[in-house]
């Protein structure tokens, strides 16, 4: 999906008001310096591409993020404010169903959510030069 035509300001507002709080809740008890950010993005569409991938695609050691509250609200934001996004999602999650269970907070998942927080922060500051 090409995120170029999303309403970035509305997605940013939803992130700041709600999604960010759910990410913090997920990470509670973890030091903010515990993980190094290794995933980056260069502009808002690219950031959303990376955010979608990290949130919804199972990875080795962390298959459960797509069932978390922040993931549901992320999907809702993308579906509402990215034209045609929901049409690209046909059965996208159905193949993962059996592998996804909530409440398995592994260290790998915490690291992945830490990366997500970094991507969202970058999404919110689109005019900053890439480090």
């Amino acid at each position: 999906y090409d995120f170029t035509n999303c309403d970035f300001e509305k997605i940013k507002a939803a992130y700041l008001s709600t999604i960010s709080k759910d990410l913090i809740t997920y990470m509670s008890g973890t030091k903010s310096t515990e993980f190094n950010n290794t995933v980056s993005c260069s502009n808002r569409p690219h950031c959303l591409t990376e955010i979608q991938s990290l949130t919804f695609n199972p990875t080795a050691g962390c298959a459960s993020l797509a069932k978390e509250m922040f993931a549901m609200k992320t999907k809702a934001a993308l579906a509402i404010w990215c034209p045609g996004y929901s049409e690209t999602q046909i059965n996208a999650t159905q193949a993962m169903k059996k592998r996804r269970k909530r409440k398995v907070t592994t260290n790998k998942c915490l690291e992945q959510v830490s990366q997500l927080q970094g991507l969202w922060r970058r999404f919110n500051r689109p005019l900053l030069k890439q480090q």
Epitope: T25, M69, A79, S86
Partner: antibody, heavy 121, light 108 residues
């Protein structure tokens, strides 16, 4: 304008199943989660689960896992809630409600009018 | 599961009174995830307050909400006859989504 119109009242026997429909109009059906909530007579509200019509993704309250099935038909913009192995305690009004961002806060905005399901032998 | 406990469960007050309903949450949640609904007999619940303190469209300004962590309140500054209803708090912080048991507000 946004509307959620639910199917009519049902009377069912214990052990049978019921399927309640919720027809959406006035918005892009596939882009919004649909929640299902029930209310037993004189009681409070109880969340059953939710479905994202875009890809059929679902979440259920553990209490209803395996007994409730949420589906959605994008061609008719209709969400369904099927409850099996009915017992008298399932007698309730069942509501569908659209999940959305309201002033950047995520919650439900539009609700169906409710469907009364009575389970009686 | 996160439990929400409302107090009181029943409240009778006079027109013009200041009324406060409390919602206690079993574990701390973000204020952005606490909402209030109003329900009248035979009707579907109506969103009333989002994110602790943001009034839904059409809700009179005599209503307000506040709180953080585990304690939240809905306040009516000057009770009107049309405010007679049952009010529910709800959390969107973690699954399963849960509601308070409701506070039935009656006009004396």
């Amino acid at each position: 304008q946004v509307q959620l119109v639910q199917s009519g009242a049902e009377v069912k026997k214990p052990g049978s199943s019921v399927k309640v429909s919720c027809k959406a109009s006035g918005y892009t059906f596939s882009s919004y989660w649909v929640n299902w909530v029930r209310q037993a007579p004189g009681q409070g509200l109880e969340w059953i689960g939710q479905i994202y019509p875009g890809d059929g993704d679902t979440d259920y309250a553990q209490k209803f896992q395996g007994r409730a099935t949420l589906t959605a038909d994008k061609s008719t913009s209709t969400a369904y809630m099927e409850l099996s192995s009915l017992r008298s305690e399932d007698t309730a009004v069942y509501f569908c409600a659209r999940g959305t961002y309201y002033n950047n806060y995520y919650g439900t905005d539009y609700w169906g009018q409710g469907t009364t399901v009575t389970v009686s032998s | 599961d996160i439990q929400l406990t409302q107090s009181p469960s029943f409240l009778s007050a006079s027109v013009g009174d200041r009324v406060t309903i409390t919602c206690s949450v079993s574990s701390s949640i973000s204020s952005s995830n606490l909402h209030w609904y109003q329900q009248k007999p035979g009707k579907a619940p109506k969103p009333w307050i989002y994110g602790t303190s943001n009034l839904a469209s059409g809700v009179p300004s005599r209503f307000s909400g506040s709180g953080s962590g585990t304690e939240y309140t809905l306040t009516i500054s000057s009770l009107q006859p049309e405010d007679a209803a049952t009010y529910y708090c709800q959390q969107w912080s973690s699954y399963p989504l849960t509601f308070g048991q409701g506070t039935k507000l009656e006009i004396k």
